[in-house]
């Protein structure tokens, strides 16, 4: 039975040219996390974090994506095209798969604030 819940940074905004941390947290379960996938809006993989093999940032994103903190992902040099949904998928044993969603809005405004509150989707 899947007892866990995924908490995410929810809806966040950040300014163009800046950076943002995408963060998901799995709680309320003792399941072992074996892999975390980070996907962007079209479901292409930004990165994989394998518990044994470590991080792999896919080549298309390696210049602008950094692993961490933790199981999260840092997007750098943001462009307007980065606006959209991002998904974290936690592969766990024995529970199975948990999935979280984050919506990132990239703003032109220089006064855009990066709101990073945790919320349960």
């Amino acid at each position: 039975m899947m007892t866990g819940t995924i908490e995410t940074t929810g809806n966040i905004s950040a300014k163009k040219g800046g950076s943002v941390i995408l963060q998901c947290h799995l709680s309320s379960t003792m399941a072992q996390v074996t892999q975390v996938n980070w996907e962007q809006h079209d479901h292409s993989l930004l990165a994989i974090r394998n518990a044994e093999l470590g991080w792999h940032i896919y080549p298309a994103f390696k210049d602008r994506v950094a692993p961490g903190p933790g199981l999260g992902l840092t997007l750098q040099s943001l462009t307007m095209n980065d606006t959209g949904e991002y998904f974290c998928t936690y592969h766990t044993y024995p529970d199975g798969t948990y999935r979280g969603r984050i919506f990132l809005e990239v703003l032109e405004s220089s006064v855009a604030e990066h709101s990073a509150r945790f919320q349960i989707p």
Epitope: T34, Q35, I48, Y58, H91, Y93
Partner: antibody, heavy 120, light 107 residues
Framework: QVQLQESGPGLVKPSQTLSLTCTVS??????????WSWIRQHPGKGLEWIGY???????YYNPSLRSRVTMSVDTSKNQFSLMLSSVTAADTAVYYC????????????WGQGTPVTVSS | DIQMTQSPSSLSASVGDRVTITCRSS??????LNWYQQKPGRAPKLLIH???SLQSGVPSRFSGSGSGTDFTLTISSLQPEDFASYCC?????????FGGGTKVEIK
């Protein structure tokens, strides 16, 4: 030298679930650094990557197929499997399994393929 | 998805000929390009990865070049066992995608 061998029914009825197994010999499916992929080739067409799985269960599926695909691993039998649900004639293809280098998806060792026809 | 286009789709050549196959991607993929050989009823075989790195055990008559969007597989002196189909694959982003293949036939 690692060898891979696909097996499963060659004929599946429309709307049913296609189920294939890949048996790995000459090496352990649990050896680090490798994922295990399924690829298919429609008659007269190019190859299409379906997805991959790690021996501990982590997966990634092609977004175009992910709603119908499930992959699993049986380390005790040194096998990994593909299930494709709600098949149609468009799923008629030769299905291959392949060892896959972690991260950058390089398919460095393949099975010889098994043909699957979807027909009533 | 990144589209991979190969040309020609087929070619006829003789033993000893120099054969060149091209692969073009719909966007830049740096050097994340792999080449495979396919024979009917046989397991496909990785020939070249990262555009130009020869896979272990592959004869040196095979070579790859290119970066960005344009890539080439060259067989310097075609041997009888080289009559087969060849396809390219990008591993720059997911999902990985393949070219339509080039069939090398005996003239």
């Amino acid at each position: 030298q690692v060898q891979l061998q696909e097996s499963g029914p060659g004929l599946v009825k429309p709307s049913q679930t296609l189920s294939l197994t890949c048996t790995v010999s000459g090496g352990s499916i649990s050896s680090g650094g490798y994922y295990w992929s399924w690829i298919r080739q429609h008659p007269g067409k190019g190859l299409e990557w379906i997805g991959y799985i790690y021996y501990r269960g982590g997966t990634y599926y092609n977004p175009s197929l992910r709603s119908r695909v499930t992959m699993s691993v049986d380390t005790s039998k040194n096998q990994f499997s593909l299930m494709l649900s709600s098949v149609t004639a468009a799923d008629t293809a030769v299905y291959y399994c392949a060892r896959t280098i972690f991260g950058v998806i390089i398919l460095d060792n393949w099975g010889q393929g098994t043909p699957v026809t979807v027909s009533s | 998805d990144i589209q991979m286009t190969q040309s020609p789709s087929s070619l006829s050549a003789s033993v000893g000929d120099r054969v060149t196959i091209t692969c073009r991607s719909s966007q830049s993929i740096s050097s994340y390009l792999n080449w495979y050989q396919q024979k009917p009823g046989r397991a496909p075989k990785l020939l070249i990865h990262a555009a130009s790195s020869l896979q272990s055990g592959v004869p040196s008559r095979f070579s790859g070049s290119g970066s960005g969007t344009d890539f080439t597989l060259t067989i310097s002196s075609l041997q009888p066992e080289d009559f087969a189909s060849y396809c390219c694959q990008q591993s720059y982003t997911t999902p990985p995608t393949f070219g339509g293949g080039t069939k090398v036939e005996i003239k």
